[in-house]
């Protein structure tokens, strides 16, 4: 598992999306076999 | 019904640690950030963190990476949250809650209310 | 990290009153701000979020507004059960901040 210290980053404000991370999914895990 | 229940009152002394628990019930575990949220006595709100219950990484505010350590165990869908070190000024009730990345923190626990005194 | 500062801290106001609650953040957080209600005994409930959008179950009675740095969550014509303390939180960047709440009593 990974640690990050939640700072604020310098995304444009052009972005209309929040800079939250979005919900976990299990695409991002990888699959065994 | 989603509901987040969360472990009873701690009377602990300075300098030692706590584990409050938080168990998941009513939607799927693995589907939302668990985060984590202190109410000091004067009812402020500080967010601790938040934890992947996939991956278990973490994203933490600063002011509590030396603090906090937040675990989940999927198998019983319950998220944990340990603090060390304690001293009078962690005093305060500790809320575990659901976010939602449209919603924000849609489901709050209970509360549990952590005492540190000698 | 996103200052939030809400006012009033304080607020006395009767049944059937429209009331305003104003939040500012210290720099552009689009339209991602939320409102909780804290209730003695209850747990925190989410009000809206993103601003303006109403959680499912709200009463529509509570309506939010704002984009950027200033946002209002307005309570028309207030109930028994809305008297409790209410509190804004940005949720546009890491780490989420809160306002310092308003409690909102009767008069």
């Known amino acids: 598992s990974e640690t990050t210290t939640g700072t604020s980053s310098n995304s444009s404000q052009s972005t209309s999306n929040s800079g939250l991370a979005p919900n976990p999914t299990n695409a991002t895990t990888k699959a065994a076999g | 019904e989603v509901q987040l229940q969360q472990s009873g009152p701690e009377l602990v002394k300075p300098g030692a640690s706590v584990r409050i628990s938080c168990k998941a019930s009513g939607y799927s575990f693995t589907g939302y950030y668990m985060n984590w949220v202190k109410q000091s006595p004067e009812k402020n709100l500080e967010w601790i963190g938040e934890?992947?219950?996939?991956?278990?990484?973490?994203t933490y505010n600063q002011k509590f990476v030396a603090k906090a350590t937040l675990t989940v165990d999927r198998s019983s869908s319950t998220a944990y949250m340990q603090l060390k070190s304690l001293t009078s000024e962690d005093s305060a009730v500790y809320y575990c809650?659901?976010?939602?990345?449209?919603?924000?923190?849609?489901?709050w626990g209970q509360g549990t209310t952590l005492t540190v005194s000698s | 990290d996103v200052q939030i500062t809400q006012s009033p801290s304080y607020l006395a106001a009767s049944p059937g009153e429209t009331i305003t609650i104003n939040c500012r953040a210290s720099?552009?957080?689009?339209?991602?701000l939320a409102w909780y209600q804290e209730k003695p005994g209850k747990t925190i409930k989410l009000l809206i979020y993103?601003?303006?959008t109403l959680q499912s179950g709200i009463p529509s009675r509570f309506s939010g507004s704002g984009y950027g740095t200033d946002f209002t969550l307005t309570i028309s014509s207030l109930e028994p059960e809305d008297f409790a303390m209410y509190y804004c939180q940005q949720h546009n960047e890491y780490p989420l901040t809160f306002g310092a709440g308003t409690k909102l009593e009767l008069k």
């Open positions: 934890i992947n219950p996939i991956t278990g990484g973490s």
């Open positions: 809650t659901r976010r939602d990345y449209d919603t924000s923190l849609d489901y």
């Open positions: 993103a601003g303006s």
């Open positions: 720099k552009s957080i689009s339209k991602y």
